[in-house]
């Protein structure tokens, strides 16, 4: 009987093709050499392979790299990549972002991963920023990365970025994390035109002080009340009755609507009765 | 820095009216960013919220407790009041009073006031 | 009333554990939402506002998360002063609600 950690006659795999499904994960062990398997990564993934045999595969690459995999094997892994703990992955160096594009292909359509987190952060790391392409790709498989960031990890985004943002992508923000991205909205869009530049700033606007909105009130951009329901408490407050007619224009008669509602609630409060009678709504303070 | 103190009587009989006040100390209870509510909890029970009022007079109320709550502010003496008419033995609870301040929430409570409805 | 659910509604835990609780609101209350601590025979004390943001003087190992309906209160490493009673409270209706509570205990 052959040893199980000798690989039986005529077994040797040339090369990684479907005869190795009928393999034993022990054969597998004995008869695959790590390099061959390394250097013909992107076949792996049109083999079903079961778990277990994954489980092999894994372990042959870990130990052929036990300092992490190179790229070239990282950007092939396919399907075993689900196989990789998150401390796997922080050994490797991901720079390519074909090579992420592929990843996160793997995992398309569920919930990000601890694993997946771990591979974007090491990604956006080795990257020093989170570019516009980066961004891009991010937010296209999953629409809430953008505000699943800090504020300290979303500071590190140039201004640059925000134009790949939609609106969509600050759905789930808190305002600690608009607060952060208002200014660099602010900064990216400043050479467009009044009416094309509030289209762009109006998912943003959670992060806006009372100084912008009294500038926007100025312009005519009748912002509607789900917009307004998202501003700052601090930056309404010193609204003025007049000046919140302005900014929302036609849209104002949606405030009865959100009056028992914040931050409509908190700025009816602090009205002069006299003030808010002139919208003609039934506001009480 | 801001205090709150509750005070009134700890038993009231059923039917009559529970009158409970708090007075702040070490701030005005006429702070434009503040609200100043009213909060009880049952024996072994969670917070239940009362109702709110702002300085200019404007309150809100607990719907379930609407038609029995009154809460008044007195901004010379810097306090704020309850009453809650027609009690009953479920009213029988710590009551607290507290600020709710605009930016943050319920930051500063008195140390409650247990408040028993029995005959 | 936006009804608030919390669970669970007690959980046995030793000191150093990471432990969650989370809030549900029963319609979106955006980020207005508030976790309080309570201790037997004392004041509730707040630890967050505004869903993530810690207040003055509370611990960094209590965050805060969520917004819309979902929130959770993360204790990052569990000390023998937490264990007490928690409580979420919206403050986007103008009629304020809390959530049942969520006793910690020691294990």
């Known amino acids: 009987e052959v040893e199980k950690t000798a690989c039986p006659s005529g077994k040797k795999a040339r090369e990684i093709d479907e005869s190795l499904i009928f393999y034993k994960k022990w054969e597998l062990e004995a008869c695959v050499d790590a390099a061959l398997l390394a250097t013909q990564m992107d076949r792996v993934n049109a083999i079903p392979f079961t778990y277990e045999q994954l489980d092999v595969l894994k372990h042959k690459l870990d130990e052929l790299y036990p300092q992490g995999y190179p790229e070239s094997v990282i950007q092939h892994l396919g399907y075993l990549f689900l196989k990789m703990s998150p401390e796997d992955i922080r050994k490797w160096n991901v720079t390519s972002l074909e090579t992420l594009k592929a990843l996160l292909e793997v995992n398309k359509g569920h919930e990000m991963s601890p694993q997946v987190a771990t591979l974007i952060d090491r990604f956006v790391k080795g990257r020093g920023q989170l570019d516009k392409d980066t961004l891009d790709t991010l937010t296209a498989f999953y629409p809430g990365y953008l505000c699943s960031l800090s504020p300290e990890e979303l500071s590190s985004v140039p201004p640059s970025s925000i134009w790949a943002v939609r609106p969509q992508d600050l759905d789930t923000c808190d305002p600690r994390q608009l607060d952060v991205l208002y200014p660099k909205a602010r900064l990216a869009f400043q050479n467009m035109n009044g009416s094309e530049y509030f289209v762009k700033i109006q998912s943003f606007l959670g992060g806006a002080p009372t100084e912008d909105l009294k500038a926007l009130s100025q312009q005519n951009v009748s912002m509607d009340l789900a917009t307004f329901m998202k501003l700052r408490t601090d930056a309404v407050l010193p609204l003025t009755v007049a000046e919140v007619q302005k900014l929302l224009g036609p849209h104002v008669e949606g405030l009865k609507a959100e009056e028992r509602h914040r931050p409509v609630r908190d700025w009816i409060l602090r009205q002069r009765q006299d003030d808010l009678d002139t919208l003609g709504l039934g506001l009480q303070g | 820095q801001v205090q709150l103190q509750e005070s009134g009587p700890g038993l009231v009989k059923p039917s009559e009216t529970l009158s409970l006040t708090c007075t702040v100390s070490g701030g005005s209870v006429s702070s434009y960013h503040d609200l100043w509510s009213w909060i009880r909890q049952p024996p072994g029970k969670g917070l239940e919220w009362i109702g709110y009022?702002?300085?200019?007079?404007?309150?809100n109320y607990n719907p379930s407790l609407k038609s029995r709550v009154t809460i008044s502010v007195d901004t010379s003496k810097n306090q704020f009041s309850l009453k809650l008419s027609s009690v009953t033995a479920a009213d029988t609870a710590v009551y607290y009073c507290?600020?709710?301040?605009?930016?943050?929430?319920?930051?500063?409570w008195g140390q409650g006031t247990m408040v028993t409805v029995s005959s | 009333d936006i009804q608030m659910t919390q669970s669970p509604s007690s959980l046995s835990a030793s000191v150093g554990d990471r432990v969650t609780i989370t809030c549900r609101a029963s319609q979106s209350i955006s980020s207005y939402l508030n976790w309080y601590q309570q201790k037997p025979g004392k004041a509730p004390k707040l630890l967050i506002y505004a869903a993530s943001s810690l207040q003055s003087g509370v611990p960094s190992r209590f965050s805060g998360s969520g917004s819309g309906t979902d929130f959770t209160l993360t204790i990052s490493s569990l000390q023998p002063e937490d264990f007490a009673t928690y409580y979420c409270q919206q403050s986007y209706d103008a009629s304020y609600t809390f959530g049942g509570g969520t006793k910690v205990e020691i294990k």
């Open positions: 009022i702002y300085y200019s007079g404007s309150t």
């Open positions: 507290a600020r709710d301040n605009v930016f943050t929430g319920f930051d500063i």
